[in-house]
């Protein structure tokens, strides 16, 4: 018979032959042959593989480093990685939670809508027209642009969401 060019789901093609993939939680020891099935072995204590695979090495479980403020939220299994979270009152810096911060700052152009708590991180909001923030802060709101008119001055340079307006003297009309 003609050797296959494609295999069924949960199989892989090797040496013109379809072999079964190893199930999640197991790694490949040896490919199948005409006479033998694929040989797989369970992952070790601190290892996992989360898909049907032909990997010869399992992945190491993630380490939740307490020096970075991390702790285990969910212990890994042979089929799943460990899930880390931050110590109480701290917040993950990313979806993967690789490190922790006390709270995040709002970048220039954004102001603090709500200061962080033990449960929720800082909530930022963009500075609307007429307001600016030129600093990175975890507590400062957007500041209103300076009103040049109240100082008997005129706007020399328009404000942005990151900069205040620049005021200057009014041009006196010559008689």
């Amino acid at each position: 018979p003609e050797p296959p060019t494609a295999c069924r789901e949960k199989q892989y093609l090797i040496n013109s032959q379809c072999c079964s993939l190893c199930q999640p939680g197991q790694k490949l020891v040896s490919d199948c042959t005409e006479f033998t099935e694929t040989e797989c072995l369970p992952c070790g204590e601190s290892e996992f593989l989360d898909t049907w695979n032909r990997e010869t090495h399992c992945h190491q479980h993630k380490y939740c480093d307490p020096n970075l403020g991390l702790r285990v939220q969910q212990k890994g299994t042979s089929e799943t990685d460990t899930i880390c979270t931050c110590e109480e009152g701290w917040h993950c810096t990313s979806e993967a939670c690789e490190s922790c911060v006390l709270h995040r700052s709002c970048s220039p152009g954004f102001g603090v809508k709500q200061i962080a708590t033990g449960v929720s991180d800082t909530i930022c909001e963009p500075c609307p027209v007429g307001f600016f923030s030129n600093v990175s802060s975890a507590f400062e709101k957007c500041h209103p642009w300076t009103s040049c008119e109240t100082k008997d001055l005129v706007v020399q340079q328009a404000g942005t969401n990151k900069t205040d307006v620049v005021c200057g003297p009014q041009d006196r009309l010559r008689a």
């Epitope: 490190s99 700052s105 600093v135 990175s136």
Partner: nanobody, 116 residues
Amino acid sequence: EVQLLESGGGLVQPGGSLRLSCAASGLTFAGYEMWWVRRAPGKGLERVAAISGSGGSTYYADSVKGRFTISRDDSKNTLYLQMNSLRAEDTAVYYCARDPYSFDYWGQGTLVTVSS
């Protein structure tokens, strides 16, 4: 090694005062926003006070407004918290934190106990 070192805590009677200091080792303060945070026994972290990088803006939690004052001396790389009219509920370990507020900057804190 980058670290923040808090000091000035101790045992004080209700109504008394303390001044906490936070010194930087291996990093600078100048231009960076700074916070004082506390953890009371058996409770979560509470953000107490903050000061902007320029020193021109401050923030205080409602629980300490009018009693605590945050200040900074960039020439000494030191942050301060003047605590007046202390109450039993101010008993906590006090920590200082610097932007970007990462855990590896975290100091050991200084314990403030308010008791008669």
